[in-house]
């Protein structure tokens, strides 16, 4: 039996800059029941506060709802582990909520086979930003990637599209079915998961419809 090992806050994420969650690895419990508490302060402020919600995001986590989330302020967060033999405190983690956004994937993915005047066909991929992000006001600047592969292929082909919400893919094989997904990343933030998969078959004898 011994004091607890040093915990480590290993991840903080926000879906929208309005709420966020931090998770910690507990370290060893020293063979004894161990309590964990997360405390935080904000830069330039003297007060220290305890985690407002240990339940919402599951074990070893702290959820900061809207009322506890400030942007443009750096949070200084630590986790303390205590058992009857002693205590141990994590290194402080400095968190700026504007830098930890992991958004939902883009939505409304649409796939359309089109043809140029020279009869060359291409796949026109279009999508919309995730619902929660107010891209128009500049609150979020999103970058996007699409990935596609034929049903038979093992490897995805990835295209970075910058801020564009559409992309044209050329040199696809007629008669093949292609799977397509998109994901997005805000400035300074993290890539979303890949969105819902859509598929389309490239016709063998594509003729342009009026």
């Amino acid at each position: 039996q011994s004091p607890p090992g040093k915990p480590e806050i290993h991840k903080c994420r926000s879906p929208d800059k309005e709420t966020f969650t931090c998770w910690w690895n507990p370290g060893s419990d020293g063979g004894l029941p161990t309590n964990y508490s997360l405390t935080y302060s904000k830069e330039g402020e003297k007060n220290t506060y305890e985690c407002p919600d240990y339940k919402t995001s599951g074990p070893n986590s702290c959820f900061f709802s809207k009322q506890y989330t400030s942007i443009w302020k750096i949070y200084i967060i630590t986790v303390n582990a205590t058992n009857e033999m002693g205590s141990s405190t994590s290194d402080p983690l400095y968190v700026d909520v504007t830098y930890i956004v992991e958004p939902e994937p883009p939505r409304n993915l649409t796939l359309e086979v089109k043809q140029l005047k020279d009869k060359k066909t291409y796949l026109w991929v279009k999508w919309l930003p995730p619902t929660i992000t107010d891209v128009k006001t500049g609150w979020f600047t999103m970058e996007y990637e699409i990935r596609l592969k034929s049903e038979e292929a093992d490897e995805w082909e990835i295209h970075f599209t910058g801020h564009q919400t559409q992309f044209k893919v050329f040199d696809l094989y007629p008669g093949q079915k292609y799977l397509v997904q998109t994901r997005c990343k805000p400035d300074h933030g993290y890539w979303s998961r890949w969105g819902q998969e859509k598929s389309i078959e490239i016709p063998n004898d594509f003729t342009l419809k009026d």
């Epitope: 830069e43 700026d96 830098y99 993290y190």
Partner: antibody, heavy 120, light 107 residues
């Protein structure tokens, strides 16, 4: 205890490449961005670029965009900086530096530095 | 690129002196400024982030004031271990850039 341990000094010929490693320990490697900064003898500090070890997303100083390549090996918690087409003015101490937190780019932990000498 | 101009390039001072180092950004950087201390043959060490916040474990004699384009690092009472070179850095826009450094020497 957080540590960034860099590979040893290198002497290179002009036109060749160098790859410097930075092994991280004492924290979860994928949590923090890693930066590379260099310092020519007796000079100031110059930022080369940064990489997010969680997904290898990187940003570069335009000055180094065509010559520097940042990579990571998550399995060994090691970051790498490769600089190609070396010239004498690339002689410098190269540092890896860990981001101070989940936020802006200030650097709370630094490697011990790797001296790269470019000489014919 | 944003230029960070530090002055003076060197300053001679005695233990107990108040030392002031300034850093001027070529364009607005808000409070996105950090300060580092570097001793010969060693790696830089973070002192201040977000223009005015001392990093964990940094003594209270180090302070910064300023925002926008003009920043000042003050060492209120110089200690023997403070003789070193100090650098400012902006992280407002890419590429992150540093000042040329100010060497604090023993008078």
């Amino acid at each position: 205890e957080v540590q960034l341990v860099q590979s040893g000094a290198e002497v290179k010929k002009p036109g060749s490449s160098v790859k410097v490693s930075c092994k991280a320990s004492g924290y979860t490697f994928t949590t923090y961005w890693m930066h590379w900064v260099r310092q020519a003898p007796g000079q100031g500090l110059e930022w080369i670029g940064e990489i997010d070890p969680s997904d290898s997303y990187s940003n570069y100083n335009q000055k180094f965009k065509d010559r520097a390549t940042l990579t990571v090996d998550k399995s060994t918690s090691t970051a790498y900086m490769e600089l190609s087409s070396l010239r004498s003015e690339d002689t410098a101490v190269y540092y890896c530096a860990r981001n101070g937190g989940l936020g802006p780019a200030w650097f709370s932990y630094w490697g011990q530095g790797t001296l790269v000498t470019v000489s014919s | 690129d944003i230029q960070m101009t530090q002055s003076p390039s060197s300053v001679s001072a005695s233990v107990g002196d108040r030392v002031t180092i300034t850093c001027k950004a070529s364009q607005y950087v808000g409070t996105a400024v950090a300060w580092y201390q570097q001793k010969p043959g060693k790696s830089p060490k973070l002192l201040i982030y977000s223009a005015s916040n001392r990093y964990t474990g940094v003594p209270s004699r180090f302070s910064d004031s300023g925002s926008g384009t003009d920043f000042t690092l003050t060492i209120s009472s110089l200690q023997p271990e403070d003789f070193a070179t100090y650098f400012c850095q902006q992280y407002s826009s890419y590429p992150w850039t540093f000042g040329g450094g100010t060497k604090v020497e023993i008078k």
